[in-house]
Amino acid sequence: GHSLFTCEPITVPRCMKMAYNMTFFPNLMGHYDQSIAAVEMEHFLPLANLECSPNIETFLCKAFVPTCIEQIHVVPPCRKLCEKVYSDCKKLIDTFGIRWPEELECDRLQYCDETVPVTFDPHTEFLG
């Protein structure tokens, strides 16, 4: 279970090449573990496969397999990153008929510096 807050190593292949290697669940969408997140992330992967934004893969990984650092912080994606990706990929999102999750609506995320991320308490819902 996830009653104790502990970072865990990333096992989702697509995200194993990210600059971070530890994560925590549940994520923003409430996915309970990495296997569920990987399946749900699959719906968005054509956006990455067609490279609609240079930041798409980073954003998807940070959203579905969030950064976990120092055993005490979970790091959601920053709003600016979200806005950039959504703007870049909007046409393709519509073309594929992809439903963008409410939890990933950019105005729900906080402005922050990607190098000094905002953190949130993993035991309370993050609304930004």
Epitope: E42, P46, N49, L50, E51, K91, T95, F96, G97
Partner: antibody, heavy 115, light 107 residues
């Protein structure tokens, strides 16, 4: 009425080049990824290349990579396929279409590579 | 690359028959699967997109189902104009790939 009209096909010798064009009308060209698909005589469909909305992204099938170049001119509503170093196995009818999904198709243009 | 395997490669059926064609992807493609119909000498025509969405203007006797790796195209009651070759195609990742086709012939 949506129309995609291919041109530029014909007979070419092995090692030669051809440039195919596809003139689009009846829809907002720049709102679609565009692609080329080919069909060798009596065979199935094979995807050749795909280009993004503004032409900055191109993707290619393994069999044509490094020989073919896909491009587009949104001001002219036209898609192109530059084919170099042609081989006998490139002989096919070439169709242009809206790439994702392949909703609108042209009637095709025949490319024959033979000596 | 994602391989798409269609079966059968051909089938004989009569008008009014229910026809089922299957398509299997070599890895999960979520629901990014399209079906096309092609008649001799003509360009393919999109029938179904996103695995189960019927393209506008396509008769409701055509339906698609499946997700992940296994997909099905069903023609509930075959009509004379349905004798053609059918192709599945994945748009999950490049290279975009087609199945080998299923030729539906008159019995």
């Amino acid at each position: 009425e949506v129309q995609l009209v291919e041109s530029g096909g014909g007979l070419v010798q092995p090692g030669g080049s051809l440039r195919l064009s596809c003139a689009a009308s009846g829809f907002t060209f720049s709102d679609h990824y565009m692609s080329w698909v080919r069909q060798a005589p009596g065979k199935g469909l094979e995807w050749v290349a795909l280009v993004g909305y503004d032409g900055s992204q191109q993707f290619y099938g393994e069999s044509v990579k490094g020989r073919f170049t896909i491009s587009r001119d949104n001001s002219k509503n036209t898609l192109y396929l530059q084919m170099n170093s042609l081989r006998a196995e490139d002989t096919a009818v070439y169709y242009c279409n809206t790439g994702i999904p392949m909703l609108y198709w042209g009637q095709g243009t025949l490319v024959t590579v033979s000596s | 690359d994602i391989q798409m395997t269609q079966s059968p490669s051909s089938l004989s059926a009569s008008v009014g028959d229910r026809v089922t064609i299957t398509c299997r992807a070599s890895q999960s493609i979520s629901s990014y699967l399209n079906w096309y119909q092609q008649k001799p000498g003509k360009a393919p025509k999109l029938l179904i997109y996103a695995a189960s969405s019927l393209q506008s203007g396509v008769p409701s006797r055509f339906s698609g189902s499946g997700s992940g790796t296994d997909f099905t195209l069903t023609i509930s009651s075959l009509q004379p104009e349905d004798f053609a070759t059918y192709y599945c195609q994945q748009s999950y990742s490049t290279p975009l790939t087609f199945g080998g086709g299923t030729k539906v012939e008159i019995k």
